[in-house]
Interface confidence: low
């Protein structure tokens, strides 16, 4: 029959050229002499001359090595004519499929990938995705199937397996608990992409993972106990500056302190504000204190942050003992 099954030709063939691929044959050759020809891109149109045919035998010839990454499939037409030039067959489709060789290494799309993840996230949390491309075939072969792996992690704290990479998607995820921005703010991972699904050529890139701040540290009073002396009747008088420490990112809502007088100020004599730079709590008198009415106030102040805690954290409380100092007041008649 005047039919040719698709022809598979490996790319980068060594020859010798011309290389016989397949024989075109018309059964009309019993009646008359047949001449064969081919047309189409790769034959009589660009890229011309890649393929040829032995006019009388019908052998299809490959004239040079093929490159699948340039052209993966050629669609030619075979023709059969009699000696007088009359067509004896309908044009026949000839498909030439260029089969892949692993002649390309994977290439990362960037030398350095950057991603970020919140501290304290659970294992399984996705961080970022790296991508390597491989021009080879990944559908019918493993030549272009890239497997990703993490080669090294710096620093190795709290241990050397904080992240994992999905071998086929390149998605980097957290694999261990213990990401703590306050201890390690950034990790550098050396990542590898290896074709042949992990058994072939390897290329390397860097993934930098920034650990983002979460409000996982409560502000803590330091010290927790204060004593202060205030003259009676003084309004707007600075009583005490309360100091807190907070390990979260400075000047962020997770660091900025919010103070609240929880107890001991029944007469609403005091107020507390946050100093914008130092983050200290500035305790001042809202109204004058009366030594004769009460010569000592014990205040309890709680501190939280502007941002909510990302988990339940104990709040820190300070105790301030305020001694009211007597002022010699004019007698009242």
């Amino acid at each position: 029959d005047w039919v040719v099954a698709p022809i598979s030709v490996p790319e980068n063939g060594k020859g010798p050229f011309p290389q016989r691929l397949n024989q075109l044959k018309s059964n009309k050759d019993r009646d008359t002499k047949i001449f064969y020809s081919i047309t189409g891109p790769g034959a009589d149109s660009p890229p011309e001359g890649v393929f040829a045919v032995e006019k009388e035998t019908g052998w299809l010839l490959l004239n040079k090595p093929l490159d699948r990454e340039e052209i993966a499939k050629y669609e030619l037409y075979g023709h059969a004519v009699s000696e007088n030039g009359a067509s004896v067959e309908e044009p026949m489709n000839i498909s030439i499929i260029v089969t892949d060789q692993n002649d390309n290494k994977p290439k990362f799309t960037q030398d350095t990938f950057r991603g970020s993840v919140l501290e304290g996230v659970l294992p399984g949390t996705s961080v970022m995705q790296v991508t390597a491309t491989d021009e080879d075939d990944a559908i019918y072969t493993y030549n272009g199937v890239v497997a990703y792996s993490i080669h090294s992690q710096e620093p190795k704290d709290p241990h050397d397996l904080m992240f994992t990479i999905h071998r086929s998607t390149g998605t980097i995820s957290v694999i261990s608990s213990g990401l703590d921005r306050e201890k390690v703010p950034e990790y550098t991972l050396t990542i590898q992409a290896t074709d042949m699904d992990g058994d072939g050529s390897t290329t390397t890139a860097v993934a930098v993972v920034e650990i983002l701040d979460a409000n996982d540290n409560a502000p803590m009073f330091d010290p927790q106990k204060y004593e202060a002396h205030v003259p009676e009747n003084a309004v707007g008088h600075e009583v005490q500056r309360l100091t807190v420490t907070d390990l979260d990112a400075p000047n962020s809502p997770a660091w900025r302190a919010t103070y609240l007088i929880m107890g001991g100020d029944d007469g609403d004599h005091f107020t507390i504000t946050t100093h914008p730079e130092s983050n200290q709590g500035i305790l001042t008198t809202r109204k004058g204190l009366d030594f004769e009415a009460k010569n000592q106030h014990t205040l309890y102040v709680e501190v939280t942050n502007e941002a909510p805690f990302v988990l339940k954290l104990p709040t820190s409380t300070a105790t301030i003992v305020v001694h009211v100092e007597d002022v010699n007041e004019a007698p009242v008649f």
Partner: antibody, heavy 121, light 107 residues
């Protein structure tokens, strides 16, 4: 399937109070925050506050302190919001919405269908 | 209190187009920004949280980006169901605040 089902529409008189509810199912009610959000007709969204049913901890938008009171009943997986001394400004649709305690990074991932409160004499 | 500026306030687009909505904040909120869509008469639906993470079941034509004080939501190849009101929301500091909204209308 996580569901947040709210109580029906309310028509109340000025000066009165109303208590609306939000019943949760399909997730750990006690360990997720329940938020309440106000939406006036044709307007945007306004956060009222939230409650952590596990221990009853609440956080309010200062604007709604004294107006809204948030409570929760763990046994029935139901959160409540009471609105007091109602005026026409309180006429709105009120949504409840869940936040996972940490995993969703404080985004509200499941919302009730909304409860319409109309204040009119 | 944190100020949020969402723009544009409204926009008209056709099915198949790509649109971008932006949200600017008065202070750094890192990546703690969410985007919601609300259709007429319905409750809001979470689309994106932590600036760029797609919520469960949200089509990949939605993408969020940005950090600090500048964020954007991009919708590729608009579908009929994408029309409605879009809100950005700070989910970092109290009070949780929403942008004024963007009304996305069909052209």
């Amino acid at each position: 399937v996580q569901l947040v089902e709210q109580s029906g529409a309310e028509l109340v008189k000025p000066g009165a109070s109303v208590k609306i509810s939000c019943k949760a199912s399909g997730y750990a009610f006690s360990s997720s925050w329940m938020n309440w959000v106000k939406q006036r007709p044709g307007k945007g969204l306004e956060w009222i506050g939230r409650i952590y049913p596990g221990d009853g901890e609440t956080k309010y938008n200062g604007k709604f302190k004294g107006k809204a009171t948030l409570t929760a009943d763990k046994s029935s997986s139901t959160a409540y919001m009471q609105l007091s001394t109602l005026t026409s400004e309180d006429s709105a649709v009120y949504f409840c919405a869940r936040q996972r305690d940490y995993g969703a990074l404080y985004a509200m991932d499941y919302w009730g269908q909304g409860t319409s409160v109309t204040v009119s004499s | 209190e944190l100020q949020m500026t969402q723009s544009p306030a409204s926009l008209s687009a056709s099915v198949g187009e790509t649109v971008t909505i932006t949200c600017r904040l008065s202070e750094n909120i890192y990546s703690y920004l969410a985007w919601y869509r609300q259709k007429e008469g319905e409750s809001p639906q979470l689309l994106v949280y932590n600036s760029k993470t797609l919520a469960e079941g949200v089509p990949s034509r939605f993408s969020g980006s940005g950090s600090g004080t500048q964020f954007s939501l991009k919708i590729n190849s608009l579908q009929p169901e994408d029309f409605g009101n879009y809100y950005c929301q700070n989910h970092y500091g109290f009070p949780f605040t929403f942008g004024a909204g963007t009304k996305l209308e069909i052209k």
